[in-house]
Interface confidence: medium
């Protein structure tokens, strides 16, 4: 297996008082047998409402690398190909689970975190506040 | 907290064989501090390519609780609010990692899991296909 | 842009055992995985196995299992491919590639490889 | 295992035509499906990623396509450069398994 520097602050891993800890096996089931869950998407090209993908890297953290989504514009592209601003491009989100080392450098503790990810784009009506 | 009826066959937390098993503290840590995650938003309804909210609920898993979301609509709405079919409404989908008892009803032994869900709809030029 | 660099060229005799170091620089090396990959002499691609450096997973090949031993060390950043019983069917050039550990367009995509090194060829001959 | 059949083995072509080299897997992979060019004397190089993403510094000549158990990787108007060997890969079932290369040379 791989050599991590251990951190001496590791807690025990039969330490009762260890806050709401479980075991969890790591051998990731995977679920999308009906589906094809790395289908080739070109969604983010082909959208009215399009997105680039930008890296954040967590070496802390699993999954370490997360491509989030950045909508390209802020209007949507119309019939023409150009950017119509009288709609809007907005971010799609969505918490997902993943797994954080903590204390940091212990090979086998770690934390569940939520963090929210910017899935793709949709292109919205804007809310238009009128002033009196 | 919550009390389990326990599996005579949870496997013992301390088996050095436990199949990449390592200790996670479920006190989730939620890293969403500069956006709203719980925020109201209505993209569902004000977007193009607009979405149902259906429940899936699995007491075995964690989170029990996930929302899917399904297209509305096989095109997306046009500026008159009718909808246009040279178009596509199509489900941005995501995987999530899940956590699921295993064996089922044991306390505090999990299996990370990866499950497919749609987190909202996009709208996208349709591909054509030219027949020869 | 991570670099996969692995140490040189080996001659052993049949039974003897082999290990091929894979360091690797320019990036974390916690974020990704590496996987060892052979080639036999005018012959195709062949996956021996790997490991998930966050976790310290290791996966092998059946046709390896028993044989095989891949480790890494993060202080150096080297992984390392062990095979014993050596035969004359071993000779080839050996490959490690780095495997990502990321969340990419809503996907976990850990499973391809994406960079790989320059290749230790090992010749295994009496 | 997952076998991946590749056609054909070997391909000899002018400068400028296009290529396409199919692969086909002995059961549904989905799209984890992976395609490598590897030139004579160097290590194999990334060429597309998930049956239809390009790796970061491919020439756009070069795509792929396909799901389920077909896939293909299309050259576009091939280059003196392209002479190599194209190999698919599956990353949807341990063990990973590659097809058997395509050779490409130019006439």
């Known amino acids: 297996g791989i050599t991590i520097p251990r951190n001496p602050g590791c807690p025990n891993s039969e330490d009762k008082n260890f806050p709401r800890t479980v075991m969890v096996n790591l051998n990731i089931h995977n679920r999308n047998t009906n589906t094809n869950p790395k289908r080739s998407s070109d969604y983010y090209n082909r959208s009215t409402s399009p997105w680039n993908l930008h890296r954040n890297e967590d070496p802390e953290r699993y999954p370490s690398v997360i491509w989030e989504a950045k909508c390209r514009h802020l209007g949507c592209i119309n019939a023409d190909g150009n950017v119509d601003y009288h709609m809007n491009s907005v971010p799609i989100q969505q918490e997902i689970l993943v797994l954080r080392r903590e204390p940091p450098h212990c090979p086998n503790s770690f934390r569940l975190e939520k963090i929210l990810v910017s899935v793709g784009c949709t292109c919205v009506t804007p809310i238009v506040h009128h002033v009196a | 907290g919550i009390t389990i009826p326990r599996n005579p066959g949870c496997p013992n937390s301390e088996d050095k064989n436990f199949p990449r098993t390592v200790m996670v503290n479920l006190n989730i840590h939620n890293r969403n501090t500069n956006t709203n995650p719980k925020r109201s938003s209505d993209y569902y309804n004000r977007s193009t390519s607009p979405w149902n909210l259906h429940r899936n609920e699995d007491p075995e898993r964690y989170p029990s609780v996930i929302w899917e979301a399904k297209c509305r609509h096989l095109g997306c709405i046009n500026a008159d609010g009718n909808v246009d079919y040279h178009m596509n409404s199509v489900p941005i989908q995501q995987e999530i990692l899940v956590l699921r008892r295993e064996p089922p009803h044991c306390p505090n032994s999990f299996r990370l899991e990866k499950i497919l869900v749609s987190v909202g709809c996009t709208c996208v030029t349709p591909i054509v296909h030219h027949v020869a | 842009e991570v670099q996969l660099v692995q140490s040189g060229a080996e001659v052993k005799k049949p039974g003897e055992s082999l290990k091929v170091s894979c360091k690797a620089s320019?990036?974390?090396?916690?974020?990704?995985?590496i996987s060892w990959v052979r080639q036999a002499p005018g012959q195709g691609l062949e996956w021996m196995g790997g490991?998930?450096?966050?976790?310290?997973?290791?996966d092998y090949a059946q046709k390896f299992q028993g044989r095989v031993t891949i480790t890494a060390d993060e202080s150096t950043t080297t992984a390392y491919m062990e095979l014993s019983g050596l035969t004359s069917d071993d000779t080839a050039v050996y490959y490690c590639?780095?495997?990502?550990?990321?969340?990419?367009?809503?996907?976990?995509?850990?499973?391809?490889?994406?960079?790989w090194g320059q290749g230790t060829t090992v010749t295994v001959s009496s | 295992e997952i076998v991946l059949t590749q056609s054909p083995d070997f391909q000899s072509v002018t400068p400028k035509e296009k290529v396409t080299i199919t692969c086909r897997a002995s059961?549904?992979?989905?799209?984890?499906l992976h395609w490598y060019q590897q030139k004579p004397d160097q290590s194999p190089k990334l060429l597309i990623k998930?049956?239809?993403h390009s790796a970061s510094g491919v020439p756009s000549r070069f795509s792929g396509s396909g799901s389920g158990t077909d896939f293909t990787l299309t050259i576009n108007s091939l280059e003196a450069e392209d002479a190599a060997t194209y190999y698919c890969?599956?990353?949807?079932?341990?063990?990973?398994?590659f097809g058997q290369g395509t050779k490409v040379d130019i006439k």
């Open positions: 590639a780095r495997v990502p550990n990321e969340f990419w367009n809503g996907y976990y995509a850990t499973d391809y490889f994406d960079n």
């Open positions: 320019g990036g974390r090396f916690r974020t990704y995985g």
């Open positions: 490991i998930t450096n966050f976790f310290g997973w290791t």
């Open positions: 059961q549904e992979i989905g799209a984890s």
């Open positions: 998930y049956a239809s």
């Open positions: 890969h599956q990353s949807d079932g341990l063990p990973y398994t």
